[in-house]
């Protein structure tokens, strides 16, 4: 049956009606409205925006819209004691200081409350010492430094370029290497695309531009003081010394003009190869310390930021389902920004606003979705996904029983080349089918489907004629829903051409130059890419909330499980002798994957053939689909990461942004050749294989015939 029949309403209230109601001009207007002043988490301005969104969502027609508040640990610079880095001479005099703020963009010179660049949650401190250049500060960069080059970072201040991996992983790696401080900078090689002008004349990063960002290693904990539980008025709070994920050494970000001054004097070892050299006119020597003439000069950090418990506000809107009000489809994105949030997050928030408006319009005409749709405007995402995580902690019992799907809605664009989707395999077919019905906004693809342009520009590496869909990692608000609670999740946005633009993120990410004008002048003047993203996100929500049978295909999970099993087996097989010595076998895992494949195939046949008019049977089959993602959750969590509980996917231990498959096995195998006790190490591999095997088999059995 069609979704319109399911909710017993007029046929005009269908997906097409919902999509036709979405307007690019409205998204443009909403983006402009959301980006005129900063909306930093914990500030009055962001509270006022929350109240505005609550009011507008009510006007749009939602059944209820509530603000939910939490008191969480946030971090701010000291207004009277600014953060900076100095080069000091042998007398301790400051002969060069890094900038105190970014030059404001044209038209914004008189805007107050622009937070200067800082690394959120950096401890206070004034370390001084020699500099060591550590490339991107990845795990492999420190391996190169310590193992191959025999360079010791202990007691040194390290300088690392942004890019490739989440900044929190860089700081963790530097701490483990014994560094006393970390300087993060944006190298033009990563944040300045050739042939494009700097803002305000183009979308490249100017030399004075700086990327803000948190440097936590929360591993899904949410508020550092209340891990596992909501940060409400009766919450027990840990002391700062016991807080989760806080860095232990001072950290500060700078732009490439300042980096030039620090790096140009570097001496010591030459960089190991070209992959360590950026685009500045400096030698990219590793150090430690400055070269001959400047060898008596040192670097000193002056960090005075404070961490304080601060109130944050989520906006939660409800559109009650007509048939299954106890089944929730959630569309959520954050509202807080570092400064103006032209792309992150307001290009996403504007799309959510327009999706709410369209759903509200249909509701005012008498329509209701089959299932309940929850809309969320999250706070404090930039400070560690705090708003979404606290809300999910507070509502975890409801969510684990009723949560059908979560669709994330942060930045709608990070480029204007093609679509980018990361999601659970359960949603692959939903995304393929939806994009085949949507029109491509791309030049040269007029009259063609989005699926066609996406497939052409971003082909699947495995299956010809299909587009690439990536694994979910983290670094955004879907984390708690997917990695902790096991709710099927997905995200979509327009992206750059990764072949030709190798810089990490978009150049102006988290800088003061992320303005409305950046989007309107350079990324999406017609707001056609925003509209397409609204159609994809909104279309997914519509189908998930309104399809009689949930649009999940468990056979796609079977396919990826086999692929992931092959991949982890091949990694392990790089150590054939040890596998033999310690009797390591993947046979059980492959057997479980085979069982899953067969059971999923049979389930799909039953799903095709069962009587859809039998409400009990329908609910039973839908519950099996809904709970399949939940079945991959291990209540004990991953080793040392209790809030990452999904056995098939977790954020990479080396890069929070990236997803890793069979993470328990992967981490057990990682760098295993360097472990001091190989017997224990391979024992852990075997334990992780058994956990994965059990989980895959148990998940398969949830799809078996009930009786």
């Amino acid at each position: 049956k069609s979704s319109s029949e399911a909710t017993n309403i007029t046929p005009k209230h269908n997906m097409k009606a919902f999509l036709d109601e979405l307007k690019a001009e409205n998204i443009k207007k909403f983006l402009h409205n959301f980006t005129q002043i900063p909306h930093l988490a914990g500030t009055e301005q962001n509270f006022q925006l929350a109240k505005q969104i609550q009011s507008q969502w009510k006007e749009f027609g939602l059944d209820s819209v509530e603000l939910t508040h939490y008191d969480v640990l946030l971090s701010y610079p000291n207004k009277t004691h600014p953060n900076y880095i100095s080069i000091i001479n042998e007398d301790g005099n400051e002969i060069f200081n890094t900038s105190l703020f970014e030059p404001p963009p044209a038209g914004y010179e008189n805007v107050s409350d622009i937070v200067p660049p800082f690394s959120a949650f950096s401890p206070q401190g004034m370390p001084e010492g020699d500099l060591v250049y550590v490339n991107y500060a990845r795990t492999e960069d420190f391996f190169k430094l310590e193992r191959d080059m025999k360079i010791n970072c202990s007691g040194k201040i390290v300088i690392a370029r942004y890019g490739k991996v989440f900044r929190g992983n860089k700081v963790k790696n530097a701490q483990l290497a014994g560094a006393t401080g970390v300087i993060l900078y944006s190298d033009p090689a990563d944040y300045f695309a050739p042939g494009v002008k700097s803002y305000p004349d183009g979308w490249n990063l100017p030399g004075g531009g700086v990327q803000r960002g948190n440097i936590l290693n929360l591993n899904g904990a949410g508020d550092p003081l209340t891990p596992g539980y909501p940060a409400n008025e009766y919450a027990y709070r840990r002391g700062i010394a016991e807080a989760v994920g806080l860095p232990s050494i001072p950290v500060h970000p700078i732009g490439y003009y300042d980096a030039q001054k620090l790096l140009e004097k570097m001496g010591g070892s030459a960089s190991p190869d070209s992959s360590w050299r950026g685009s500045l006119k400096v030698p990219y020597n590793v150090g430690p310390g400055f070269t001959g003439n400047f060898s008596t000069q040192k670097v000193k950090m002056h960090i005075h930021s404070t961490s304080e418990v601060t109130r944050i506000y989520n906006v939660i809107g409800t559109l009650r389902g007509a048939v299954e009000p106890d089944r929730y489809v959630i569309l959520g994105g954050h509202r807080d920004s570092w400064v103006f949030g032209g792309i992150d997050p307001q290009s996403g928030a504007a799309v959510v606003h327009e999706i709410v408006r369209s759903f509200g319009t249909l509701k005012k005409e008498g329509w209701r979705p089959r299932r309940t749709i929850l809309f969320a405007s999250w706070d404090a995402e930039e400070f560690g996904l705090l708003g979404s995580t606290e809300w999910a902690e507070e509502n975890s019992r409801l969510l684990q029983e009723r949560g059908v799907a979560y669709i994330n809605a942060d930045s709608s664009i990070e480029g204007n080349y093609t679509l980018r989707v990361d999601c659970t395999p359960l949603m692959y077919s939903l995304v393929y089918n939806l994009t085949k019905e949507l029109e491509s906004p791309d030049e040269g693809f007029e009259g063609k489907s989005l699926y066609e342009s996406w497939t052409k520009k971003s082909p699947s590496p495995e299956f010809s004629g299909m587009p690439r869909i990536s694994k979910l990692g983290s670094g955004n608000d879907f984390e708690v829903f997917f990695q902790r609670l096991g709710i099927a999740s997905g995200r979509a946005r327009y992206t750059k051409n990764w072949e030709t633009n190798k810089f990490s993120s978009y150049p102006l990410y988290h800088s003061v130059y992320e303005t409305y004008e950046l989007v309107e002048k350079f990324y999406d003047p017609m707001f056609k890419y925003h509209l397409t993203v609204a159609q994809v996100r909104g279309g997914m929500v519509f189908e998930l909330a309104n399809s009689v049978v949930l649009p999940f295909d468990c056979r796609d999970y079977a396919v990826v499980l086999r692929k992931y099993a092959d991949k982890i087996y091949n990694i392990s097989m790089k150590h054939p002798q040890e596998m033999k010595t310690y009797s390591v076998s993947f046979d059980s895992l492959f057997s479980a994957v085979k069982n899953f494949t067969e059971i999923a195939s049979k389930f799909s046949e039953r799903l095709r053939d069962f009587d859809k008019s039998n409400p009990i049977l329908l609910r039973m089959m839908n519950d099996q689909l809904m709970f399949l993602e939940r079945a991959f959750i291990d209540p004990l969590g991953l080793p040392d990461r209790p809030f990452y509980r999904h056995v098939i996917y977790a954020p990479s231990s080396h890069n929070k942004y990236a997803g890793e498959s069979f993470p328990g096995i992967y981490d057990a195998l990682f760098d295993i050749e360097s472990k001091v006790d190989p017997s224990q190490a391979w024992g852990e591999v075997k334990r992780q294989i058994s956990i994965a095997t059990f989980t895959v088999q148990a998940a398969a059995e949830t799809l078996s015939e009930v009786a």
Epitope: S99, L100, F101, P103, A106
Partner: nanobody, 123 residues
């Protein structure tokens, strides 16, 4: 129209002080490093001082170090030069100039100049 207007010059005795001002219009001072440059009668241009857009760094010519202080009030779009312990050789036409690099961290080339204000140090 983008322009710089200097003021505060005059005749002063050696050892005394003077404060020059430079009012910027047509562009936001807050985004640019700013220079003071001088030209003594019959001589070439001499760079005097530079201050980064954010006030984090100040650079001075050796001839004025310890005597002159460059400062700015971005909210008033104005640059200043406080000149103490003036000497005969400080007699010159003083110009303020905008650094061409937005957000620059060290002195670079100038792209906009004022008309200058005359300072005469004489007993």
């Amino acid at each position: 129209e983008v322009q710089l207007v200097e003021s505060g010059g005059g005749v002063v005795q050696p050892g005394r002080s003077l404060r020059l001002s430079c009012a910027a219009s047509g562009f936001p001072l807050i985004s640019y490093g700013m220079h003071w440059v001088r030209q003594a009668p019959g001589k070439g241009l001499e760079w005097v001082a530079f201050m980064t857009y954010d006030g984090s760094n100040r650079y001075y010519a050796d001839s004025v170090k310890g005597r002159f202080t460059i400062s700015r009030d971005n909210s008033k779009n104005t640059l200043y030069l406080q000149m103490n312990s003036l000497r005969d050789e400080d007699t010159a036409l003083y110009y303020c100039a905008r650094d061409r690099i937005v957000g620059g961290r060290v002195p670079d080339a100038f792209d906009i100049w004022g008309q200058g204000t005359m300072v005469t140090v004489s007993s």
